[in-house]
């Protein structure tokens, strides 16, 4: 059964910036992922980003960069403006549509304990997974 | 304008073949999924047969498995579905879709549809 | 398979009423519920996608509500062109099913 794994960290250097990682782990060629913060894109979350492999990606605040890691698999890096940071208890969720099979998401957040300086970079394993 | 204009349909005998072929105008037919949807006569709406952009993923209805084929050609822009071993059941209204992955793969553009008799 | 049950089968409606349709989901399908218009004679046409965003130019009157297993259709006022059978449709989770469609008839 495909699974969507996700991995927010926070940045070591900045700790105002965020990137989260999601990756799908299944057969089938991906068509587009959709990243929500606050829960899922049409459940009350808010789209952050779309990435399609071939028409390329739209963002929206406070959405710095989306890009491909690989091909079944994506980055978001993300600037809170603010004095506090409000992602470090956010859920943010994705979600792999793959044509004809259909769309895998998951929801995940920063861990609670993290220490920024020790971060690790994501793995294709189910980090965090919590499929809706 | 996007158009798909199906045709092949016709009346057929049972365990017969039909070839149907939807030719697409008006948008970069090699860029999009496309898919057969039939109409039963009891307006049923059933997805028969799909295929990626890649024309690599493709989807086949558990019952004409092994019995169709979709295919593309993107040189004519046309989408066909050969049909075999045709089965009284698969008497319907065949339409010809596009899919919008911004959509949510929902069919954004149909075809007017081809109709497909199978006659003992 | 996930099944799309929709209710009612039949309506009949007076133009300038206001119309419910209800699609529920055997499992949930996210966000990803399409519906669609099938005019006496014509080809079924795009109506909302995404559950509540509306295909170009669809008038807004026509609006669509939902996520996970219960979606609504809403046409705020009816008008007679609105004679049709409606259609759900899921595309979350392959193989992709359709409601059984309500038809719409006009007093």
């Known amino acids: 059964t495909p699974e969507v794994w996700v991995q927010v960290q926070m940045e070591a250097t900045e700790l105002s910036s965020f990137t989260v990682h999601c990756g799908f782990l299944g057969p089938g060629s991906i068509s587009l992922v959709t990243v929500s913060w606050g829960g899922p894109d049409g459940a009350g979350g808010t789209k952050l980003a779309v990435l399609h492999p071939e028409l390329g990606t739209r963002q929206w605040a406070p959405a710095r960069q989306a890009r491909w890691e690989t091909q079944s698999s994506i980055s978001l890096a993300l600037e809170d403006s603010g004095a506090s940071s409000p992602f470090a208890n956010t859920t943010f969720c994705c979600k792999f549509a793959s044509f004809p099979e259909g769309s895998w998401e998951s929801c995940g957040s920063l861990p609670p304990s993290s220490d920024p300086g020790l971060s690790a970079p994501p793995t294709p394993v189910p980090i965090l997974r919590a499929d809706l | 304008d996007v158009q798909l204009v199906e045709s092949g349909g016709g009346l057929v005998k049972l365990g017969g073949s039909l070839k149907l072929s939807c030719v697409a105008s008006g948008f970069t037919f090699s860029s999009y999924h496309m898919s057969w949807i039939r109409q039963t006569p009891e307006k049923r709406l059933e997805l028969v047969a799909a295929?990626?952009?890649?024309?690599?993923?493709?989807y086949y209805l558990d019952t004409v498995k092994g019995r169709f084929t979709i295919s593309r050609d993107i040189a004519k822009n046309t989408l066909h579905l050969q049909m075999s071993s045709l089965k009284s059941e698969d008497t319907a209204l065949y339409y010809c879709?596009?899919?919008?992955?911004?959509?949510?793969?929902?069919?954004?553009?149909w075809g007017q549809g081809t109709s497909v008799t199978v006659s003992s | 398979s996930i099944v799309m049950t929709q209710t009612p089968k039949f309506l009949l409606v007076s133009a300038g009423d206001r119309v419910t349709i209800t699609c529920k989901a055997s499992?949930?399908?996210?966000?990803?519920v399409a519906w669609y218009q099938e005019k006496p004679g014509q080809s079924p046409k795009l109506l909302m996608y995404y559950v509540s965003h509306r295909f170009t130019g669809v008038p807004d009157r026509f609006t669509g509500s939902g996520y996970g297993t219960d979606f609504t259709f809403t046409i705020n006022t009816v008008q007679a062109e609105d004679l049709a059978v409606y259609f759900c449709h899921q595309a979350y989770r392959s193989p992709w099913t359709f409601g059984g469609g309500t038809k719409l008839e006009i007093k």
């Open positions: 499992q949930s399908v996210s966000n990803d």
């Open positions: 879709a596009r899919h919008e992955d911004y959509y949510g793969f929902a069919m954004d553009y």
């Open positions: 295929i990626n952009s890649n024309d690599i993923n493709t």
